[in-house]
């Protein structure tokens, strides 16, 4: 089994977690991908997922989480904006591949969010000045209801139906982060 490793990433309240999860292009380009949190003693919980099949460069927003899947680059970009202390925890990117178990991408991220925003006057990330709000056309994808155990040798999801429950997402408002699509050469 692959050794599960994690990397600590520490940010302040109000900041944005911005990570890139790599995947094998040939195998997973159009597969549905998800961002999960793993709480102690619990199974991973899906917070947001891409569409099924995943669309190229098409932002999906669930609350303060934005997912963008770049098929040409084998890369899922995950952003959690306006971080709160309560967001601290262990996160991972996974690929849904029913009937097989979800495939974990990269190392897990141990996010630590501390009090106190680091911004200078007039340059707050959450300022309403010069802010590009996420367009209303952004998709909120439906995620599989169940997620798999925390081990790498996981059992298949109990259900792969495209259903969503209130428990499977973060519903928060006031998303005023500046969102820009990366420019690839």
């Amino acid at each position: 089994a692959t050794k599960l490793t994690e990397e600590k990433y520490e940010l302040k309240e109000g900041q944005t977690l911005d990570v890139k999860c790599d995947y094998t292009l040939e195998k997973f380009a159009s597969s549905q991908k998800a961002w999960q949190i793993i709480r102690d003693g619990e199974m991973p919980k899906t917070l947001a997922c891409t569409e099924r099949p995943s669309k190229n460069s098409h932002p999906v927003q669930v609350g303060r989480i934005i997912l963008e899947d770049y098929h040409d680059h084998g890369l899922l970009r995950v952003r959690m904006v306006n971080l709160q202390v309560e967001d601290s925890g262990l996160y991972q990117c996974v690929i849904y591949q029913p009937p097989k178990e979800p495939h974990m991408l990269f190392d897990r991220i141990r996010l630590v969010v501390t009090k106190g925003f680091s911004g200078t006057p007039g340059s707050n990330e959450n300022s309403t000045q010069n802010v590009y709000k996420i367009p209303p056309t952004t998709t909120k994808a439906l995620c599989p209801l169940y997620t798999s155990p925390r081990t790498v040798t996981q059992a298949p999801p109990k259900s792969t139906a495209d259903v969503s429950t209130p428990d499977s997402e973060i519903n928060l408002t006031n998303v005023t982060d500046i969102i820009r699509v990366p420019v690839f050469n």
């Epitope: 050794k3 490793t5 990397e7 600590k8 990433y9 520490e10 940010l11 302040k12 900041q15 944005t16 911005d18 990570v19 890139k20 999860c21 790599d22 995947y23 094998t24 292009l25 680059h73 084998g74 890369l75 991408l105 990269f106 190392d107 991220i109 680091s118 990330e125 010069n130 982060d177 500046i178 820009r180 990366p182 420019v183 690839f184 050469n185």
Partner: antibody, heavy 119, light 108 residues
Framework: EVQLLESGGGMVQPGGSLRLSCAVS????????MSWVRQAPGKGLEWVSE????????YYADSVKGRFTISRDNSKNTLYLQMNSLRVEDTAIYYC????????????WGQGTLVTVSS | EIVMTQSPATLSVSPGERATLSCRAS??????LAWYQQKPGQAPRLLIY???TRATGIPARFSGSGSGTEFTLTISSLQSEDFAVYYC??????????FGQGTKVEIK
């Protein structure tokens, strides 16, 4: 302990070629994106190229696109930079660097290898 | 391409004094900014990431602040080993990953 060790630098004439290597240890090489960053004598840092981990996607600075090729051998824990059609302005110390925490900032660097392009 | 501009180019400070270095991005990079220290003959060393988080093993006298386009690195009380060149780097838009031109902190 994480270690990155570059080699392959040297003197070459304009239009010539060199292949740099970066042998790494202390982390799961195949999982991480790696980059080459260079520094011309007395100048600042310039990102040159990156190769992602699982996807193997590659990216280049405009100044080297079409001339340099980044690659990796995960079985040998080694990153490479093939440099062709070298120019005088490519003269620099070339560092390989490991990406930190799913993001393109660099927490570990090699000691660098000097490439001198001169006639 | 996002252009990173650092100021001043050179900062002359006495040991024990405070040093304030600035970095400006040509467009917002949110908090996706890192600071590196480089001493002569050595590779750069990561000091700060996420605009304000100290990397492992970095002393508390180093602090970063800012978001969007304006960032600051502060060294509260300069020690002899802090005299070096400091670079900022954005990792919001990629590629390329762009660095500032550097600020040299020298002994006054």
């Amino acid at each position: 302990e994480v270690q990155l060790l570059e080699s392959g630098g040297g003197m070459v004439q304009p239009g010539g070629s060199l292949r740099l290597s970066c042998a790494v240890s202390g982390f799961t090489f195949s999982r991480y994106a790696m980059s080459w960053v260079r520094q011309a004598p007395g100048k600042g840092l310039e990102w040159v190229s990156e190769m992602r981990g699982s996807s193997g996607s590659t990216y280049y600075a405009d100044s080297v696109k079409g001339r340099f090729t980044i690659s990796r051998d995960n079985s040998k824990n080694t990153l490479y930079l093939q440099m062709n059609s070298l120019r005088v302005e490519d003269t620099a110390i070339y560092y390989c660097a490991k990406e930190f925490s799913s993001n393109s900032l660099f927490d570990y660097w090699g000691q660098g290898t000097l490439v001198t392009v001169s006639s | 391409e996002i252009v990173m501009t650092q100021s001043p180019a050179t900062l002359s400070v006495s040991p024990g004094e405070r040093a304030t270095l600035s970095c400006r991005a040509s467009q917002s990079v949110n908090s996706n900014l890192a600071w590196y220290q480089q001493k002569p003959g050595q590779a750069p060393r990561l000091l700060i990431y996420g605009a304000s988080t100290r990397a492992t093993g970095i002393p508390a006298r180093f602090s970063g602040s800012g978001s969007g386009t304006e960032f600051t690195l502060t060294i509260s009380s300069l020690q002899s080993e802090d005299f070096a060149v400091y670079y900022c780097q954005q990792f919001y838009n990629w590629p390329p990953y762009t660095f500032g031109q550097g600020t040299k902190v020298e002994i006054k």
